[in-house]
Amino acid sequence: TPLGPKWPEPVFGRLASPGFPGEYANDQERRWTLTAPPGYRLRLYFTHFDLELSHLCEYDFVKLSSGAKVLATLCGQESTDTERAPGKDTFYSLGSSLDITFRSDYSNEKPFTGFEAFYAAEDIDECQVAPGEAPTCDHHCHNHLGGFYCSCRAGYVLHRNKRTCSALCSGQVFTQRSGELSSPEYPRPYPKLSSCTYSISLEEGFSVILDFVESFDVETHPETLCPYDFLKIQTDREEHGPFCGKTLPHRIETKSNTVTITFVTDESGDHTGWKIHYTSTAQPCPYPMAPPNGHVSPVQAKYILKDSFSIFCETGYELLQGHLPLKSFTAVCQKDGSWDRPMPACSIVDCGPPDDLPSGRVEYITGPGVTTYKAVIQYSCEETFYTMKVNDGKYVCEADGFWTSSKGEKSLPVCEPVCGLSARTTGGRIYGGQKAKPGDFPWQVLILGGTTAAGALLYDNWVLTAAHAVYEQKHDASALDIRMGTLKRLSPHYTQAWSEAVFIHEGYTHDAGFDNDIALIKLNNKVVINSNITPICLPRKEAESFMRTDDIGTASGWGLTQRGFLARNLMYVDIPIVDHQKCTAAYEKPPYPRGSVTANMLCAGLESGGKDSCRGDSGGALVFLDSETERWFVGGIVSWGSMNCGEAGQYGVYTKVINYIPWIENIISDF
């Protein structure tokens, strides 16, 4: 029997009946065995076929077989009801080998020319399967020359049989207090040859409850307990299962915080699997009872491990743990069924005793000593000498625990000294230097340092003076001895004040004229205002109308008198303002340099002389009465003048304060 070519030789060729294309002889039997490489099959087709036709091809025939299976028995020229001729059909081996047998019987009624066939090896597409046949691969099949391979979807791994996809279904850990888990692909059929392990791992103190839901379908056996596929549930206490079949297992209360679920499948079957809904429970904590004036949130039927509640107080009440305030309070239920902290109180907000108001007082409106939520107090300033600044003084204890004004301010009101009060009345007449009486010049300040000088009290902790009077002490403010509330220069009865800082106008140049001859002294403590110590007012914008030429101002001080000595008693003089040009001209003659009188100065005095301020008065205030407010204000600061005080044709020169209001305000607000 001739053999066809064997792999690895090229597998293709031609077969023909003996004597082809002539007629074939009787009693012939010829067999060809064709072998292709593994993963290939043989394809055969006929280009000529002419054999004796007989019933069921019993006489002459070509038989095609592959392994034990006969693929076709062929005869005749065309197919009939009971016989088959190849026609244009192509035949394929079932594996990699194909046997072809030709036989002719002892006679032919007429000559037959036999057959001619061609064959070739071709790749088998193992991925194509006939309807109803099991697929080659579980998931994805990939054909290639001489073979195929299988691959799996994400979440699966190829089994060692190279065809089945086993689920990668182990190592999943569920840590939430409730959840769902199911067999892979549920509710579609679960994968074969898989071993799945699921863990539920909750915090100690929880107990897992398992409920099988929807449907349950795991391959079973009528006699043996779950021999094929099974589901097992294991806790640290006991094992449940195995489970299989079609009946939903009952609820399992594990009494454990850890559960392992194992699901094993074999290589066969088509079942939908299972789904578990798990919940958890724990020892409940005592039901939280809200404190008076508070409420619990969230409200639950019960509170178990890890559950929490918060306490919220009504408006006007605050969370307190004893004396310690809390902005928020949350308690958490512990595994032993106790809360992790005790219930706080919702105590009525207490703003506490109101702060003392300097130079003022406070009155309890709601009731004596009542300082709790919505209580009202009234601040007021000491009458006559103090007035309340931008506030009505009414404060309410608000929910945040602060006394709050009607304007929403939490800071104390300010009792500002009333300025410009004087016991003196002026008739506007010019008269000689007079002794001051108590309360006439309560703003008068005596400054003792290297020399005697003066100043005027502003507010209750500033002194306005001349730069030249305190220049030497600008770096040693504490060297200034500041006295007020006295008329007698040498009296031991006075109010002592000390300087914290000296601010000399940056435009002042010492020993080079007196332009910008102005300074402020900040006191290290506020002074108490009374009839003998009262600040002078600063000029209003409209003040110029009270400081025109010939308007009367008053200068006061302990400076040199006509006798050439410092005055023992505070003296004052009423003097008119001098026309600025007239004053400028008076000081343009030698020995005075040109430009001695600047726009920052004003002059006052009599052309005839005799009324003037003098050495020792430096820094003191030249004051004017504002007839609209009936308050005295500082228009000038004693600065300089002729060598001989009160000289005819010469005038006292004063720093023009109205030019320096922004400078004064800036210093005071900044410091």
Partner: antibody, heavy 115, light 107 residues
Framework: EVQLQESGPGLVKPSQTLSLTCTVS?????????WNWIRQPPGKGLEWIGY???????SYNPSLKSRVTISRDTSKNQFSLKLSSVTAADTAVYYC????????WGQGTTVTVSS | DIQMTQSPSSLSASVGDRVTITCKAS??????VAWYQQKPGKVPKALIY???YRYSGVPSRFSGSGSGTDFTLTISSLQPEDVATYYC?????????FGQGTKLEIK
């Protein structure tokens, strides 16, 4: 992690004002709780000075109230202690601390009152 | 002010002993009491708050009890590292006050 750190001069002259600052990290002083100052004289027990709460309200030990001011700077997450007119009896280790539900203390700073 | 009186002022015990320190308040402080441990040269460390609640990280051998005026700190099995001074503190009312301290030593 919540941390508190005291800072300030270790030597203060009698009659002057003792000033200390506590810098808090890891927690905002406006979020909750009372932020306390506590002191411990050498070889003695602990004495509470006062606190400033999350809202800025203060509470002082009545025995020190006339001399104590506790304030805060929320932008720097700091709170401060000022104790005026100090004497040798104010020599101590000064701690800042948050008490009760949170319990964290600074390392303490030794302040000596001496001329 | 509420006085917090601790007893004993000092005590000596052996490793493994059960140790009890008491604290008596001069008036009712509810359960607003804390216990502190201070080792020499160290910062006080809170052990217990609200009379019986242990701070996280505090060994379970430390426990607190009491309410009103009488409070107890118990160390169930004394360890060498427990050598320290222990303070009770009330935070029920202003001023917050501490006990005078109990010095604990190992025999």
């Amino acid at each position: 992690e919540v941390q508190l750190q005291e800072s300030g001069p270790g030597l203060v002259k009698p009659s002057q004002t003792l000033s200390l600052t506590c810098t808090v990290s890891g927690y905002s002083i406006t979020s909750d709780y009372a932020w306390n100052w506590i002191r411990q004289p050498p070889g003695k027990g602990l004495e509470w000075i006062g606190y400033i709460s999350y809202s800025g309200r203060t509470s002082y030990n009545p025995s020190l109230k006339s001399r104590v001011t506790i304030s805060r700077d929320t932008s720097k997450n700091q709170f401060s202690l000022k104790l005026s007119s100090v004497t040798a009896a104010d020599t101590a280790v000064y701690y800042c601390a948050v008490l009760y539900a949170l319990d964290y203390w600074g390392q303490g700073t030794t302040v000596t009152v001496s001329s | 002010d509420i006085q917090m009186t601790q007893s004993p002022s000092s005590l000596s015990a052996s490793v493994g002993d059960r140790v009890t320190i008491t604290c008596k308040a001069s008036q009712n402080v509810d359960t607003n009491v804390a216990w502190y441990q201070q080792k020499p040269g160290k910062v006080p460390k809170a052990l217990i708050y609200s009379a019986s609640y242990r701070y996280s990280g505090v060994p379970s051998r430390f426990s607190g009890s009491g309410s009103g005026t009488d409070f107890t700190l118990t160390i169930s099995s004394l360890q060498p590292e427990d050598v320290a001074t222990y303070y009770c503190q009330q935070y029920n009312s202003n001023p917050l006050t501490f006990g005078q301290g109990t010095k604990l030593e190992i025999k």
